[in-house]
Each structure stands twice: as C-alpha cells, then as structure tokens.
C-alpha cells in the first residue's frame, strides 16, 4: 500500500512513487502569483507529506505549500520568475523527490469567460466572442486560444479552431441547419512563456437557423 511508515522508518517511503506535476498562474490575484502541485498517483498517502519550493524567490530562500485536500498550493508575490526553483516533496526534514522548474515554463492561463455567439443574418455567419483576464496582465498577455464546437448530438466530434484574437467568425454554410451546437474555448501561453492549456470556459449553446426552402438559405 502507498504511504510512508508511521514509525519514522523511511524505508517504505523511498519505495513509493512520489512523482508530481505543478502549474503556475501569474498575476492570478492582482500582483499575486500561484503555484499548484499534485501527485500523479492518486493513491499516494499524503498524510504527512509536504511540498516546499526553494530558490528563485524574493526575500526568502524557501516557501511551504498549503495543503488543500489532494493538492498543494501557494499564493505569493515572492516568485522571482527568473531562473529555476527547486520543488521538493518532504516528510519532516527529508526530501523524497525534487524537481528543478522555471515557473515561467509551467504557466496555466485562467480560463476564458463571457463566451457568446451572435448570428448575423445579412452576412450569413456567426460571430464568436469571448474574454480573457490576460489582456490586462503584465506578463502572460499573449495567448493561443482553442475554440472547440460540435453538434450537440455528436458526442466526440469536436471541430477545433486555433486563433490569437478573441473573436472568430463561423460561416453558416459550414454548419448544419436547424441544429443545436455547443461551443467552448481554452487558452495556452504563446509568447515567451510556456505551459499548459487552461481549463475550458463554460460551454455556450446556440441553434442554427432552418433552411429557407425557396432560396436554399437558412432562416
């Protein structure tokens, strides 16, 4: 079974797989940054395990994470954002495993929001717009967005469009008439910073018009 020996004997602990992954979010709360880490094995007994980050910090050498159920979390202004930090899983003073990571290479943007779709009758198209908090940020401003849409009845048939702006036009003729569509969007750093896709925005649902029989156009 996973977990380390309660009696202080660390032999068992050293056999466990303590591999973990982390992501950072810069300027997630004003000028505060956050760092979130979690074990890759959900069965690890985390009872006495702690995370610590050292190096590439401002005015301190190390910081301890807060444990929030299954994840470990820091929110701080003290990330230098230059050079690599050493992130370690610890039991007491003993480090079980460590990773050297530059926090600017594991950035996960905040999810886009305010996704909406407006049908333009004259242009026979749909204008997709959404918002992102990153437009106001100092650091991670440039993102690549992934807009995914599908006909609601097609469970896994998503169409993806990559774009750098927050506006997309979908041509009416590319969509099925009189159909319900689901659309969502996510973001990833695209300039200077590296990292991961954000969470998906909440989905938006829209219906395409029926075909107008006389003209072959959708209503």
């Amino acid at each position: 079974e996973s977990g380390y020996a309660q009696n202080g004997d660390l032999e068992d602990a050293e056999l466990d797989d303590y591999s973990f992954s982390c992501y950072s979010q810069l300027e997630v709360n004003g000028s505060q940054h956050s760092l979130t880490c979690a074990f890759e094995d959900p069965d690890v007994n985390i009872t006495n395990l702690e995370f610590e980050i050292c190096g590439a910090l401002v005015e301190v050498k190390c910081l301890n994470f807060r444990k929030l159920q299954e994840i470990y979390f820091i929110e701080t202004k003290k990330f230098l954002l230059i050079g690599k930090s050493n992130i370690c899983v610890k039991v007491g003073e003993k480090s079980l495993t460590c990773k050297k990571i530059d926090l600017t290479t594991i950035v996960k943007p905040e999810a886009p929001f305010d996704l909406s779709v407006v049908y333009r009758e004259g242009a026979n198209d749909f204008v997709v717009t959404f918002n992102t908090s990153h437009l106001q940020k100092k650091y991670v401003k440039v993102l690549m967005h992934d807009v995914a849409y599908r006909q609601e009845k097609d469970e896994n048939k998503w169409t993806h469009v990559n774009l750098s702006s927050t506006k997309l036009t979908l041509l009416q003729r590319k969509l099925q008439p009189a159909a319900m569509y689901e659309i969502k969007v996510r973001s990833i750093p695209d300039h200077y910073f590296k990292g991961f896709w954000s969470e998906w925005s909440p989905s938006y649902y829209f219906r395409t018009p029926e075909i107008n029989n006389s003209s072959g156009e959708m209503d």
Partner: antibody, heavy 117, light 111 residues
Framework: EVQLVESGGGLVKPGGSLRLSCAAS????????MHWVRQAPGKGLEWVSL????????YYADSVKGRFTISRDNAKNSLYLQMNSLRAEDTAVYYC??????????WGQGTLVTVSS | NFMLTQPHSVSESPGKTVTISCTRS????????VQWYQQRPGSSPTTVIY?????PSGVPDRFSGSIDSSSNSASLTISGLKTEDEADYYC?????????FGGGTKLTVLQ
Amino acid sequence: EVQLVESGGGLVKPGGSLRLSCAASGFTFDDSVMHWVRQAPGKGLEWVSLVGWDGFFTYYADSVKGRFTISRDNAKNSLYLQMNSLRAEDTAVYYCARQGDYMGNNWGQGTLVTVSS
Amino acid sequence: NFMLTQPHSVSESPGKTVTISCTRSSGSIDSSYVQWYQQRPGSSPTTVIYEDDQRPSGVPDRFSGSIDSSSNSASLTISGLKTEDEADYYCQSYDFHHLVFGGGTKLTVLQ
C-alpha cells in the same frame, strides 16, 4: 563540455558604441538565464545585466540602465550586450555567465572593452 | 539596496585553515542564497560554493560555506590550504533581480 566564448571587445572613444557577443555550447542554452558581469582593471566583479531564458525578462544595474541592452538569440545559442554612450568607467573585462541551476556555474574567458579618447 | 563587505585580504600558511567572511549591510543574510567564486590571477571566476553551502562537483571538500544569522554574514572556509588556493574570492547574493557581489578578498598562501 560547457563553453562560453565572448567577442566584440576593443578600443572605443567615449560616447561610442560596441556590441558584445557570447557564443554558448555544451548545454541547453534556451533553458538558461544568462548574465553579463564586468571587472574593471584591478577591481572586483560588478553585475551588469541578466536575461531570462526567453528574452522576456531583462534587468540592468543602475550604472548601465538606459545605455546598455541585453538580448539573446536562442536559435543561434548566442547572448548579446549592446553598449551605447560608453564612458571611461565602462572600461572592463566583460564576462558572460550562465546561471543554469545556480548562478555562475559557468563563465566565459571575458572580452576587454577599453573606453578612451 | 544592500552591500556585501569582505576583508580586503587574508593570509595563512599551507595546511592551515582560513575563513573569509561576507557581511550583509542591511536585510537578513538568510533572505537569499550566497555564492562564492574563486578567481585565480589572469583567469575567469569559477564557483566554489553555491546556495550557501553546496559544492559543485569537482570542488574539493576542503571548501565549505556557512551562514551565521547572528552576525548577518556568510563565510567561506578553506581547510588544508594549498598554494593553488591563492586567488581572489568573491561572495555574491541577490537583491530582487539584481546580483550583488562583495568587494573580493585576496587570499595569500604564505611560503
């Protein structure tokens, strides 16, 4: 084997410009924070500037701010220092240094910049 | 902004132990890591200690680093002095994104 080779130094008149280069090899350049550090003749080490792995973050010592510009070309494994409005007090050996997992793991051999009329 | 102050020079005989201090003028010495560099005459600096007390591979264990909060200083100790240890030694720490170097200490190994 890690190598950092500086070039571009020389004699220049006050008010003039020079561009220093540092060719890097033997390590993952685009993963490393890079610094310029200088040493005036017979004096100690003085930090000049740094650039993050991607070129986004750049920082300068107050003594060179507004006159010097650090940059990098990861495709060419090269670090640069554009020095404008040079002064006599900028005379020094200029070293490029790789931070890697800690500062100063590797230093170049240095290039001498002499500012004199 | 803080300064790092080192003795201008120290000297000791071969085989003995010497300690070079590096005192931070303001703020805590504990608030950022200290590195030590050796610079032999006519050569580039090389790292002998990083992150307060860590030795890069290839640096002999005669070199050790430590931090003393009570004196707000870092120290580099070299035991079993050898003639090849004669060099300038610099401490270095961080002031936010800026690097701060001590003024350097000339170590003379007496013959």
